[in-house]
Interface confidence: low
């Protein structure tokens, strides 16, 4: 094919008359925006064939793509079609006008895309932008294509200047559809209902547009049909999400609920499934055992935790001695009721640096209007052992006595033991232990009460020494299970004045 | 129209603290279970805490986050709430109320949610 002229672009005047010819070997054609305008076709004597395109009186409108083709060009090469592109630059022309369906670029994929914005004179400086936005944006413009690259899914306008006066084009609009491997996921408001209550399930996909849902559901194989509500959430990444609704549902309604999601543009789909169970009336199960037995450190913090299984959501309360506990201003007690799954629950009672008037009976108390449960504990404060008093005397029976008083809960054990070699013990020698009734050299009398008020036990031990004939260490040690506590005296023989 | 707007969020010390807002309107707030998820810069949504409408006024917490957050809820005001203790580098993210029908577990419907706040958590 032979262009006269040969171009490839041409800039011509306003309101002239130009002529374009094309030839070549087959019959060929002048093609204007896939149409064929009219033109003189020939033959001439060689057999060469013609086609000549007369533009009369040439305004902007004019500019664009011109193509000569072979008249039979199915199936020819890509060579065998030549391209001119002509320019007409016309004040009165802004940007040349789009179909529509220009205005919309529509994507499946992150693809370089063109802004077909253009003008009638190659020599304007022509610039994007957002729609609201002033900066002109670094794109790349190619005058006889427009603005390329990759887009926002956004709107934008291009802007050129024509003499003083400013021109905008139609505004562009870039969609991004979304069409990806399916996510679904189904929810239900809840998996667990009473009859005569609603159903309602959600299936949601994310990141694809154009999805089809089919749901399959216990009341749909007995012939019930229920209509779904298909609705878009305006967030990114896309969702979009089917709604399932079951009025007043029935023991029947129990089941499997599956959603079915196909997507048409790739073919690909997924399906998922959730249990609904429907109960007749509503319930409340402990689970795991609470000991009726609790202990708490003095002057710790103790959580107490039970868990229970409940539907619909139970009122949860706690008690102490028959009176109703509630989070303290002081933030000594701390009550919490958290749901760990839909119908589970885990509900604590934190007792924050334990007091001893904080012991007693302890009772937390699920509760609807269909069922309820408690469960009672008794709480006792655990108290450290201390050492209060540690005496020797020398009553007149010629003995020697040492008198250890100590109190804790629970209660204390005493240990009493002896170190007869001051120098060595009880580094490098084992004290030895006293009180054994074996031993006739020592005695031992040990009485415990236990005070009400204080809750806690105070024991009062008193070791007789039958014969001391050289100073002696004695220990007393209070052992229980949160602690131990240890003093020492020294006890000297009657004859001897004991000097440090 | 679903409106969510949350404010509170900042630039904050590891180990500080904030605490987060969210007025809601366009919908039955009282009636409505509410969440916070976020996003962490380059990562997906991440649900964090929601809390039950109704008398029984249930809140759960993800493993993340248990034991240093605080969901709570003012009716009267159509206010949710996310109050932010022992704040850490790894809770830099957007945070984002979101309006739940329910969480199942930890599987949550995060839409529609609000615009975001930015949290901040850096030295």
């Known amino acids: 094919l032979v262009v006269t002229p040969p171009g490839p672009e041409l800039v011509l005047n306003v309101s002239s008359t130009f002529v374009l010819t094309c030839s070549g070997s087959a019959p060929v054609v002048w093609e204007r925006m896939s149409q064929e305008p009219p033109q003189e076709m020939a033959k001439a004597q060689d057999g060469t064939f013609s086609s000549v395109l007369t533009l009369t009186n040439l305004t902007g409108l004019d500019t664009g793509e011109y193509f000569c083709t072979h008249n039979d060009s199915r199936g020819l090469e890509t060579d065998e079609r030549k391209r001119l592109y002509i320019f007409v630059p016309d004040p009165t022309v802004g940007f040349l006008p789009n179909d529509a369906e220009e205005l919309f670029i529509f994507l499946t994929e992150i693809t370089e895309i063109t802004i077909p914005c253009r003008v009638t004179d190659p020599q304007l400086v022509v610039t994007l932008h957002e729609k609201k936005g002033d900066v002109a944006l670094p794109v790349p413009y190619d005058h006889q294509r427009g603005f390329s690259g990759i887009f926002e899914d956004r709107s934008y306008i291009c802007k050129t200047t024509i003499g003083d006066r400013e021109v905008d084009s139609d505004a562009y609009y870039v969609y991004r559809l979304q069409v990806s491997s399916i996510n679904v996921s189904v929810n239900a408001v809840q998996t667990v209902v009473r009859q005569g209550e609603n159903i309602t399930l959600m299936c949601i996909v994310i990141g694809n547009e154009v999805v089809n849902f089919e749901w399959t559901y216990p009341r749909k194989e007995s012939g019930r049909l229920v209509e779904p509500v298909t609705d878009f959430l305006l967030d990114m990444p896309y969702h979009i999400r089917s709604i399932l609704h079951i009025p007043s549902a029935e023991l029947e309604d129990s089941g499997t609920y599956t959603c079915n999601v196909t997507e048409s543009v790739n073919d690909h789909q997924d399906e998922k499934a959730i249990n609904i169970t429907v109960v007749e009336s509503g319930y409340v199960r402990l689970l795991g055992e609470v000991g009726t037995l609790q202990f708490a450190e003095l002057h710790r913090s103790r959580t107490l935790q039970v868990v229970f299984e409940a539907y619909p959501p139970p009122t949860v309360l706690w008690f102490k001695d028959n009176r109703t506990l509630g989070d303290s201003s002081a933030g000594e007690i701390a009550l919490s009721t958290r749901n760990v799954s839909e119908t589970r629950y885990v509900s604590e009672l934190t007792l924050v640096r334990v007091k001893v008037a904080e012991a007693g009976h302890y009772t937390m108390r699920a509760f609807h209007e269909d069922a309820e449960v408690q469960l009672s504990f008794q709480l006792q404060i655990n108290v450290p052992v201390r050492v209060l008093e540690l005496s020797e005397s020398h009553p007149d029976s010629g003995e020697q006595t040492v008198r250890c008083r100590g109190r804790g809960m629970p209660q204390p054990n005493i240990i009493w033991s002896a170190c007869r070699d001051l120098k060595r013990c009880p580094r490098e020698l084992p004290p030895t232990l006293l009180g054994n009734s074996s031993e006739e050299e020592s005695q031992l009398e040990t009485n415990v009460t236990y005070w009400e008020e204080e809750q806690e036990f105070e024991v009062v031990s008193t070791l007789r020494l039958q014969h001391v004939d050289r100073p002696l260490s004695v220990r007393c040690t209070l052992r229980n299970a949160v602690g131990q506590d240890t003093q020492e005296v020294i006890v000297v023989p009657h004859s001897l004045p004991f000097k440090v | 129209e679903v409106q969510l707007v949350e404010s509170g969020g900042g630039l904050v010390q590891p180990g500080g603290s904030l605490r987060l807002s969210c007025v809601a309107s366009?919908?039955?707030?009282?009636?409505?279970?509410m969440s916070w998820v976020r996003q962490a810069p380059g990562k997906g949504l991440e649900w964090l805490s929601g809390i039950s409408s109704g008398g029984g006024r249930s809140t759960t917490y993800a493993e993340s986050v248990e034991g240093r957050f605080t969901i709570s809820r003012d009716d009267a005001k159509n206010t949710l709430m996310l109050q932010m203790n022992s704040l850490k580098s790894e809770d830099t993210a957007v945070y984002y109320c979101a309006k739940t029908g329910y969480c199942s577990g930890y599987n949550c419907n995060f839409a529609p949610r609000g615009q975001g706040t930015q949290v901040t958590v850096s030295s």
């Open positions: 366009g919908f039955s707030f009282s009636e409505s279970a």
